[in-house]
Interface confidence: low
């Protein structure tokens, strides 16, 4: 539906509030170096003028699409060559070229300071003289370290964010109420964002045919008593709009996703009997909750997949005929009988099936040829089950920390030429797993377990692809999205690996560790594992784990030392020197 | 191929019936909700009423809503509106089409008409 002004179209969809959240997010993530007061100078001027078109849409520049409106903001930007070098030559390009620079442009990873959260006191001093800046400091410190998060999920956080707030500076003790609501905050955003990216990699990388399957077969797990067409007509639905959010478009993403919200709840009989507790929220609560929505029951007396998809005398004819209408229906009926399964894995199947039909429908026998594809599916469950049951007992045996720590081992000795922030960034969120899935019932692990590992380790391949170090990783990251889980398990130790040399200031420390928290703390010992593994690659598990007893018990006892400083530089030494020994 | 072929249209009085059929190939049509939609001369497409993949959840506009009757017969790949009680405005060009899509075949004309 064609509007006059798209700009004014947005604003009066979106209401004030929202579209300057988005407009600020929207900036962030692309000029991710400039301080938030220039980007607020921007959205004033952006807004102004929004409410211009409002007035009459027939104003100078209103007809003008949003891409142009934002491009020419962010190129009227004096010090922009100055700050973002080469970024600068996206504006020398017409229309959707210069976008499309901008977009490539986004860094997964920017050289920014980590973000320190002021202690409680100051926290509940700004938010109250001014909760919209606080806010909004919220919104672009967030945006620009993550340029890819889901821009509408965002203002949830953000609204999440106040709410907390509110709650917790009218406490006496401000910090013990706040901390624990805003770490467990910070958990769930930055799950958020490393689930978008893989959806934003998915779509870049494989288009939009990739992520319908994926949309569609979420969809079927989550709504089972839906009909193919109202699964179509949703997942098409959702594919659009990551596609919008994805490619910067934030002001008709987050249109689409409360219009999308809006369809869901005046069709729920047709969708699910889950729905109506999130239909009764305002619409960022109402979208997220739909997001989360428990999976509906499975209707009684579904048949066996057989009837329609192997023993049917029309297999091939209907696959023929109109093939992605036929994989999307065997998807479907596949997914909507197993919610026990990843994604992944159901995408894998139809894959596996589809592969089937290819080389059987040209055969003299088709239906001799495929007419075990079903049992053949067998060793593709059994994997990632056997994966799960493995990675839990591990879990349950080591703790998180121990966990991790094995998981460091394992991917160093797979891709040592990856830089140790990264294996350790990557090996610790891969060991919170264990905390978030292995908890689960049986039921609920797999696809748990599964897609939260496909996530993480799209954060990997983003990060390689950067700056490419490992032929080992690049292979399992060029391959197909579903496909990289199996590809990084079965990744062997790198044979091509020449050690690192050993340098003793890599594992020399001093006082100042104690005072860091002990995640930092953590980190910083396992930063050492990971140096440890690269110096010594075919060091054995009872050998880095004395190490790395050792290790910790110098860290504990020149902690409570009375001269820490002397301590570390007496025992440091003799730490590294007997290490060297015990992995000689 | 997908392919939906509409018949049963036709010149008929008002206050008179048709039974309008859809026979459908190339798909899993169990599989599928579908819908009737109808343009009528010089006006935009208008959805008419619709049927979830099993038969049970049927919906229909309230221009038509105690006149016309959707079913469907899964086994014979077949999609049924029954018109009762029809008026001058229910002329139109009659599609049967999957889900909410948009027609793709030639339809059926439904000229009400004394």
């Known amino acids: 539906d064609a509007h006059k002004s798209e700009i004014a179209h947005r604003f009066k969809d979106l209401g004030e509030q929202h579209f300057k959240g988005l407009v600020l997010i929207a900036f962030s993530q692309f000029l991710q170096k400039c301080p938030y007061e220039e980007h607020v100078k921007l959205v004033n001027e952006v807004t102004d003028f929004a409410k211009t078109c409002v007035a009459d849409e027939s104003a100078e520049n209103c007809d003008k699409s949003l891409h142009t409106l934002f491009g020419d903001k962010l190129c009227a930007i004096p010090t922009l060559r100055d700050s973002y070098g080469e970024l600068a030559d996206c504006c020398a390009k017409k229309e959707p070229e210069r976008n499309e620079c901008f977009l490539k442009h986004k860094d997964d990873h920017p050289n920014l300071p980590p973000f320190v959260r002021p202690d409680a006191e100051a926290m509940c001093t700004s938010f109250q003289e001014n909760a919209v800046t606080f806010m909004g400091h919220y919104l672009h410190e967030v945006a620009r370290r993550h340029p890819y998060f889901y821009a509408p999920e965002l203002l949830y956080y953000a609204e999440k964010y106040s709410a907390i707030m509110t709650e917790c500076c009218g406490e006496a003790d401000k910090a013990a109420c706040i901390t624990p609501k805003l770490d467990a905050l910070k958990e769930k955003a930055l799950a958020s964002s490393v689930n978008q990216r893989l959806k934003c990699s998915s779509l870049q990388r494989f288009g939009q045919r990739a992520f319908k399957a994926w949309a569609v077969a979420r969809m079927s797990q989550k709504f089972p008593k839906a009909d193919f067409a109202e699964i179509t007509k949703l997942a098409t639905d959702l594919t659009k709009l990551t596609e919008e959010c994805c490619h910067g478009d934030l002001l008709e993403c987050a249109d689409d996703r409360a219009e999308l919200a809006k369809y869901m709840c005046e069709n729920q009989a047709s969708i699910s009997s889950k729905l109506q507790a999130c239909c009764d929220k305002p619409v960022l609560k109402k979208s997220h909750c739909l997001s989360e929505v428990e999976n509906d029951d499975l209707p009684a007396d579904l048949p066996s997949l057989a009837a329609d998809f192997v023993e049917d005398k029309e297999v091939c004819k209907n696959y023929a005929e109109a093939k992605d209408v036929f994989l999307g229906t065997f998807l479907y009926e596949y997914a909507r009988r197993h919610p026990d399964y990843s994604v992944a894995l159901l995408l894998r199947l139809a894959k596996k099936y589809e592969a089937t039909l290819e080389k059987c429908c040209a055969e003299a026998d088709p239906s001799a040829c495929y007419g075990k594809v079903l049992d053949e599916f067998q060793p593709l469950v059994e994997e990632p089950k056997n994966l799960v049951k493995a990675n839990c007992e591990l879990f349950e045996k080591l703790g998180e920390y121990g966990f991790q720590n094995a998981l460091i081992v394992r991917y160093t000795q797979k891709a040592p030429q990856v830089s140790t922030p990264t294996l350790v960034e990557a090996a610790r969120n891969l060991g919170k797993v264990g905390s978030k899935c292995c908890v689960l019932p049986e039921a609920q692990r797999l696809p748990c377990v599964e897609d939260y590992i496909s996530a993480i380790l799209n954060r990997v391949c983003v990060l390689h692809e950067k700056t490419p170090v490992s032929e080992q990783v690049t292979k399992c990251c060029t391959g197909s999205v579903v496909e990289r889980r199996p590809c990084f398990s079965a990744l062997p130790v790198d044979e091509t690996y020449v050690p690192k040399e050993f340098k003793a200031e890599t594992f020399t420390f001093h006082a100042d560790i104690c005072s860091l928290p002990e995640k930092e703390k953590q980190m910083k010992k396992q930063a050492a594992l990971v140096e440890l593994v690269k110096h010594k690659p075919k060091a054995t598990g009872p050998q880095l784990r004395t190490v790395l007893g050792e290790f910790t018990a110098f860290l504990d006892k020149c902690c409570k030392a009375e001269d820490k400083e002397a301590c570390f530089s007496e025992d440091g030494p003799k730490l590294v020197a007997s290490s060297q020994a015990a992995l000689a | 191929q997908v392919q939906l072929q509409e018949s049963g249209g036709g010149l008929v009085q008002p206050g008179g019936s048709l039974r309008l059929t859809c026979t459908a190939s190339?798909?899993?049509?169990?599989?599928?909700?579908m819908s009737w939609v109808r343009q009528a001369p010089g006006k935009g497409l208008e959805w008419v009423s619709a049927i979830s993949a099993d038969g049970s959840d049927k919906r229909y506009a309230d221009s038509v809503k105690g006149r016309f009757t959707i079913s469907r017969d899964n086994g014979k790949k077949m999609l049924t509106l029954d018109m009762n009680s029809l008026k001058p405005e229910d002329t139109a060009v009659y599609y049967c089409?999957?889900?909410?899509?948009?027609?793709a075949s030639q339809g059926t004309q439904v000229t009400v008409s004394s």
């Open positions: 190339g798909f899993t049509f169990r599989s599928f909700g």
């Open positions: 089409v999957i889900g909410r899509g948009s027609p």
